[in-house]
């Protein structure tokens, strides 16, 4: 399955919007910095086929979408930027979803992919717990915004590598 050219443009737009969403200086939140243990090994593109990479990317974007779709998120960010960001993620989900279905059809997830999906889920669990513990403070959201920019960059790079493989 070839992801449409608009998909990579959407990736870049999502990153730009997320950058624009920053409200406070990252430097004023240094005390709140946290290592969320992003599962980089799941995004290096070497250990599994394109089909499996796409379902891990889907999980990544789906969890990001869910994270920014909460009431707490709505209260934290400028509404029009948040809506545009969510729209970009939603479109990416549509593209990835179509690819997962087209590549393999609806079937059981390959065993080696299961742990990759769980690793992404656990990563977002750590982010969710961090926000809860910090009571969704502005600095906590700023730390999370910077973290998601990093993880989306990894996703974008993996998608570039997948296109080169084609």
């Amino acid at each position: 399955c070839d992801l449409p050219q608009t998909h990579s443009l959407g990736n870049r737009r999502a990153l730009i919007l997320l950058a624009q969403m920053g409200r406070i200086s990252h430097f004023s939140c240094l005390k709140d910095r946290h290592d969320f243990g992003f599962p980089e090994e799941e995004f290096d593109g070497h250990q599994f086929q394109k089909t499996q990479a796409i379902s891990v990317l889907h999980e990544m974007i789906q969890q990001t979408f869910n994270l920014f779709s909460t009431e707490d998120s709505s209260a934290a960010w400028e509404q029009s930027l948040l809506e545009k960001f969510s729209t970009e993620l939603y479109q990416q989900l549509n593209d990835l979803e179509a690819c997962v279905i087209q590549e393999v059809g609806v079937e059981e997830t390959p065993l080696m992919n299961v742990d990759s999906i769980l690793a992404v889920r656990k990563y977002f669990q750590r982010i969710t717990l961090y926000l809860t513990e910090k009571k969704y403070s502005p600095c906590a959201w700023e730390v999370v915004r910077a973290e998601i920019m990093r993880s989306l960059s990894f996703s974008t790079n993996l998608q570039k590598r997948l296109r080169r493989k084609d």
């Epitope: 869910n66 989900l93 609806v106 079937e107 059981e108 997830t109 769980l118 656990k122 969710t128 717990l129």
Partner: antibody
Framework: QVQLVQSGAEVKKPGASVKVSCKAS????????MHWVRQAPGQGLEWMGE????????IYAQKFQGRVTMTRDTSTSTVYMELSSLRSEDTAVYYC????????????WGQGTLVTVSS | EIVLTQSPATLSLSPGERATLSCSAG???????LYWYQQKPGQAPRLLIY???NLASGIPARFSGSGSGTDFTLTISSLEPEDFAVYYC?????????FGQGTKLEIK
């Protein structure tokens, strides 16, 4: 509010199949994995597997592999769990439970569907 | 598969007493993915505690959770009549996800 409504009780003969449905409402159906958990009479809870309603991919517990099939219908926001080659030990209440993260993990459950396997 | 063993199987106490329920894992579980559920007869399970020690929405402060690695505890500081039920620990740290066999908390 989030609601999961399951189909009614079923009585099946050994060797037959059963298909239980779980209709979701109150949230964006495609965004959360749906899980199936069963409970035999007087026994504990047992995780069977999960399905991503967005693209339909599934993850099954090895114990049920080859006998369980989870599917979804996005047009009706419904997930299905089909269990084949039924035996008496499959007599149980079958629950759907919505995934999520933090306080949302299995925070929402269906009311349960009793499946009785008897000759 | 991570086996969760709960003890005791049955706990007989009176209202007002303190209840301590244990959950022991066959191998290490990330505390973020250890949960507790309460179940009453004829009802679906209800989320009590998430990520070892966090109270779910609407759960009274008399419930608390602690632990790490392979040993986890659910404590009810002063039992109320409505607390008598079956309690399950649950992990989603690795596939397949598993539940303990349950601890039945009954009125003495």
């Amino acid at each position: 509010q989030v609601q999961l409504v399951q189909s009614g009780a079923e009585v099946k003969k050994p060797g037959a199949s059963v298909k239980v449905s779980c209709k979701a409402s109150g949230y964006t159906f495609r965004n959360y994995w749906m899980h199936w958990v069963r409970q035999a009479p007087g026994q504990g809870l047992e995780w069977m597997g999960e399905i991503n309603p967005s693209h339909g991919r599934t993850i099954y517990a090895q114990k049920f592999q080859g006998r369980v099939t989870m599917t979804r219908d996005t047009s009706t926001s419904t997930v299905y769990m089909e269990l084949s080659s039924l035996r008496s030990e499959d007599t149980a209440v079958y629950y759907c439970a919505r995934g999520g993260l933090g306080p949302a993990w299995f925070a929402y459950w269906g009311q349960g569907t009793l499946v009785t396997v008897s000759s | 598969e991570i086996v969760l063993t709960q003890s005791p199987a049955t706990l007989s106490l009176s209202p007002g007493e303190r209840a301590t329920l244990s959950c022991s894992a066959g191998s290490s579980v990330d505390s973020s993915e250890l949960y507790w559920y309460q179940q009453k007869p004829g009802q679906a399970p209800r989320l009590l505690i998430y990520s070892t020690s966090n109270l779910a929405s609407g759960i009274p402060a008399r419930f608390s959770g602690s632990g790490s690695g392979t040993d986890f505890t659910l404590t009810i500081s002063s039992l109320e009549p409505e607390d008598f039920a079956v309690y399950y620990c649950h992990q989603w740290s690795s596939y397949p996800f598993t539940f303990g066999q349950g601890t039945k908390l009954e009125i003495k």
